[in-house]
């Protein structure tokens, strides 16, 4: 496994990219003046206690910003949050940190990111533009859970 985070560019099937706005990740159409975030992706070192065949458990961070994606409950509902955390601090832990972990599954060119802490909940964007990234259980038309990854550098 890689010991350095892999920088990637992520967009959904509607060619919307991830942008950081007021400490929230939103998906917006790719335009000249849009500055997409670069996502850092690194595999978890400890998979013994994680489910097998569900995907590659990874941490997702915002490149150079010391922010990582995590899942936590707000009331009864799991929510997607950005937390100040160094992705390498997560990688170097002696235990998996499930709240920051996602099962990365690839089918052809499409990738999905399922929360390890909340199985069945996926990173998604609303089919409408300019919406925050969310966690959803509904894999239908209202939300897009399929993303395309482009390796950078």
């Amino acid at each position: 496994k890689s010991e350095m985070p892999q920088p990637v560019s992520i967009q959904d099937i509607n060619h919307r990219v991830w942008v950081l706005q007021d400490q929230i990740l939103i998906a917006v159409p790719r335009k000249d003046r849009v500055s997409p975030v670069t996502i850092s992706l690194i595999s978890c070192r400890h998979v013994e206690t994680l489910e097998k065949d569900r995907g590659n458990p990874i941490y997702l961070g915002l490149n150079g910003l010391n922010l990582c994606l995590m899942c936590a409950k707000a009331g009864d509902q799991p929510t997607l949050q950005l937390k100040e955390k160094d992705i390498m601090d997560l990688y170097n832990q002696p235990e998996p940190v499930k709240s920051f972990l996602f099962y990365h599954s690839q089918s052809g060119r499409n990738s999905t990111f399922e929360s390890v802490a909340f199985p069945g909940w996926f990173i998604a964007v609303s089919s409408e533009g300019g919406c925050p990234l969310i966690l959803t259980q509904e894999l239908g038309k209202a939300n897009t859970t399929d993303f395309g990854l482009t390796m950078l550098f």
Epitope: E48, T49, L90, N92, Q93, P94, E95, V97, K98
Partner: antibody, heavy 121, light 111 residues
Framework: QLQLQESGPGLVKPSETLSLTCTVS??????????WGWIRQPPGKGLEWIGS???????YYNPSLKSRVTISVDTSKNQFSLKLSSVTAADTAVYYC?????????????WGQGTLVTVSS | QSVLTQPPSVSGAPGQRVTISCTGS?????????VHWYQQLPGTAPKLLIY???NRPSGVPDRFSGSKSGTSASLAITGLQAEDEADYYC???????????FGGGTKLTVL
């Protein structure tokens, strides 16, 4: 039945290095699933994790002790060792070695009997 | 001060039921990490009593049971016996501190 046995000096002078070895019998230290750890207990106090090692050499240390701790493994002797440098009276404790088994988080499922190390001049 | 908080002592008469609590935070028990329990009889090494919140290793009587909810866990002992007199420690992991953490220990006295 897996057994762990700590060995090493019972008395160490301040500023010197504490060295202990744990010998494992009844099982192989080279098992992929397990780490091997050191935990200490000052007299009359609670337990403190010092660090853990895998047979491959991967180590994890308690950040509060990291600058002074080295844990190593010798698979040929079925042993792992602890070195703690620049000791003070605060390092006086019973030192236990233990097997660290897969769980979430990992669990210390087999323990040695412990060895008391006193730091004194 | 321990990261996981336990009552310093509990007591009960033979045959009674006692519980020992273990309270953590959002970076350990509340982050989804399980809780393990150890029994330390006087003058001996700790022995694994409960792992993964509620599982007993073989040889541990079913008088001992564990549970977890939110940021805390508890150990229950029913049908208290004189030989249960010991120190009990909970253990988990804290991802903010990057350490395996133990409670401060609870001394159980059988009256």
């Amino acid at each position: 039945q897996l057994q762990l046995q700590e060995s090493g000096p019972g008395l160490v002078k301040p500023s010197e290095t504490l060295s202990l070895t744990c010998t494992v019998s009844g099982g192989s230290i080279g098992s992929r699933s397990y780490y091997w750890g050191w935990i200490r207990q000052p007299p009359g106090k609670g337990l403190e994790w010092i660090g853990s090692i895998h047979y491959s050499g991967t180590t994890y240390y308690n950040p509060s002790l990291k600058s002074r701790v080295t844990i190593s493994v010798d698979t040929s002797k079925n042993q792992f060792s602890l070195k703690l440098s620049s000791v003070t009276a605060a390092d006086t404790a019973v030192y236990y070695c233990a097997r660290v088994a897969p769980s979430y988080p990992r669990v210390f499922d087999y323990w040695g009997q412990g060895t008391l190390v006193t730091v004194s001049s | 001060q321990s990261v996981l908080t336990q009552p310093p002592s509990v007591s009960g008469a033979p045959g009674q039921r006692v519980t020992i609590s273990c309270t953590g935070s959002s970076s350990n028990i509340g982050a989804g990490y399980d809780v393990h329990w150890y029994q330390q009889l006087p003058g001996t090494a700790p022995k694994l009593l409960i792992y993964g919140n509620r599982n007993r290793p073989s040889g541990v009587p079913d008088r001992f049971s564990g549970s977890k909810s939110g940021t805390s866990a508890s150990l229950a002992i029913t049908g208290l016996q004189a030989e249960d007199e010991a120190d009990y420690y909970c253990q988990s992991y804290d991802y903010s501190l990057r350490v395996y953490v133990f409670g401060g220990g609870t001394k159980l006295t059988v009256l």
